[in-house]
C-alpha cells in the first residue's frame, strides 16, 4: 500500500525540515488521495471500456454524486472561503458512502481502495479543524446511506462497473476543485 503523507523517505531523510503547516498538510493529503484514485482508475480502465465512454453518455445516471457549483463559493467568481469550506467538508462526507461501496470492487488494488477511504477520513478531520462554522455542515443520514449502499451492491455487473468508474471520476474532479480553492485560502 502507498505510504501515508509525511511518512515517505524524503521526510525521513530530512528530520530537521520545518513541520508542515495545516494548509500544507491538507494539500499533501489531497495529492496523496489523488494518487490513490489514479491507481484505482488504472485498474478500472484496464478491466472495462468505461473510460472510453463520453462524459455525456455517462451523465445519464441516477447517482447523486457531490459536485461543485458556482453557488458553493469555490470558484473565482463568487469565491467565499467559509461557504466553500463548508461545501468541501459536506461533499467529502457525502462521498464516504460511495468510497465504502468501492471496497471489494478491486482485485489487485484492494489496499489502495482502503487507503483512499481512510485518507479521506483523515482529510475530513483536518478540514473540520480549519472550519469556523461547523454548524453549517450537514452529516448524511446513516440509514439513508445504508439503503443506498444495498441498492448499489444489488446492481448487475455492468452497472457496478459503471458506478465504480463514475465515483472515481467524480471524486477526482471534486478533490481537484477543492484543492484549487483551498490554495486560495
Amino acid at each position: 500500500a502507498p505510504v501515508p503523507p509525511g511518512e515517505d523517505s524524503k521526510d525521513v531523510a530530512a528530520p530537521h525540515r520545518q513541520p508542515l503547516t495545516s494548509s500544507e498538510r491538507i494539500d499533501k493529503q489531497i495529492r496523496y488521495i489523488l494518487d490513490g484514485i489514479s491507481a484505482l482508475r488504472k485498474e478500472t480502465c484496464n478491466k472495462s471500456n468505461m473510460c472510453e465512454s463520453s462524459k455525456e453518455a455517462l451523465a445519464e445516471n441516477n447517482l447523486n454524486l457531490p459536485k461543485m457549483a458556482e453557488k458553493d463559493g469555490c470558484f473565482q467568481s463568487g469565491f467565499n472561503e467559509e461557504t466553500c469550506l463548508v461545501k468541501i467538508i459536506t461533499g467529502l462526507l457525502e462521498f464516504e458512502v460511495y468510497l465504502e461501496y468501492l471496497q471489494n470492487r478491486f482485485e489487485s488494488s484492494e489496499e489502495q481502495a482502503r487507503a483512499v477511504q481512510m485518507s479521506t477520513k483523515v482529510l475530513i478531520q483536518f478540514l473540520q479543524k480549519k472550519a469556523k462554522n461547523l454548524d453549517a455542515i450537514t452529516t448524511p443520514d446513516p440509514t439513508t446511506n445504508a439503503s443506498l449502499l444495498t441498492k448499489l451492491q444489488a446492481q448487475n455487473q455492468w452497472l457496478q462497473d459503471m458506478t465504480t468508474h463514475l465515483i472515481l471520476r467524480s471524486f477526482k474532479e471534486f478533490l481537484q476543485s477543492s484543492l484549487r480553492a483551498l490554495r486560495q485560502m
Epitope: 477526482k172 474532479e173 481537484q176 476543485s177 484549487r180
Partner: nanobody, 124 residues
Framework: EVQLVESGGGLVQPGGSLKLSCTTS????????VGWFRQAPGKEREFVAD????????WYAESVLGRFTISRDNAKNTVYLEMDGLKPEDTAVYYC?????????????????WGQGTQVTVSS
C-alpha cells in the same frame, strides 16, 4: 514530466492583442492543469492565470481579470492565453507550467514542468 513549448509572443502596441500557445507532445496532457506565469526584467515571476483538468476551473490574477482568457484544446494538446487590452506593464517573458494533479494554483511550487518562455513586449 512533460515538455512544454510556448509560442505567440511578440511586439504589440498598447491596447493590442496577442494569443499565446502552450503545447506539448505528452500523451496525457488533458489531465494536467496548466498555469501561465510572467517575469518582467528585474522582477519576480508572477502568476497570471491557470486552467484545471476541468476546463471550467479557471483562475486569474487581479491585474489581468477581464482582459486575459485562458482556454484549452485537448485534441491539440494546447492551452491558450488570449491577451486583450494589453498595457506596457504586461511586458514580460511568459512561461507556461503544468501540474500533473490537474489542480494548478497561483504559486510556482504547484507545478512540476516548465516551458522556456516567450517574450511579450507592449510598446508604442
Amino acid at each position: 514530466e512533460v515538455q512544454l513549448v510556448e509560442s505567440g509572443g511578440g511586439l504589440v502596441q498598447p491596447g493590442g492583442s496577442l494569443k499565446l500557445s502552450c503545447t506539448t507532445s505528452g500523451r496525457r496532457f488533458s489531465e494536467y492543469a496548466v498555469g501561465w506565469f510572467r517575469q518582467a526584467p528585474g522582477k519576480e515571476r508572477e502568476f497570471v492565470a491557470d486552467i484545471g483538468e476541468q476546463a471550467e476551473n479557471t483562475w486569474y490574477a487581479e491585474s489581468v481579470l477581464g482582459r486575459f482568457t485562458i482556454s484549452r484544446d485537448n485534441a491539440k494538446n494546447t492551452v491558450y492565453l488570449e491577451m486583450d487590452g494589453l498595457k506596457p506593464e504586461d511586458t514580460a517573458v511568459y512561461y507556461c507550467a503544468a501540474d500533473k494533479y490537474g489542480v494548478g494554483g497561483n504559486a510556482q511550487g504547484y507545478y512540476d514542468s516548465w516551458g522556456q518562455g516567450t517574450q511579450v513586449t507592449v510598446s508604442s
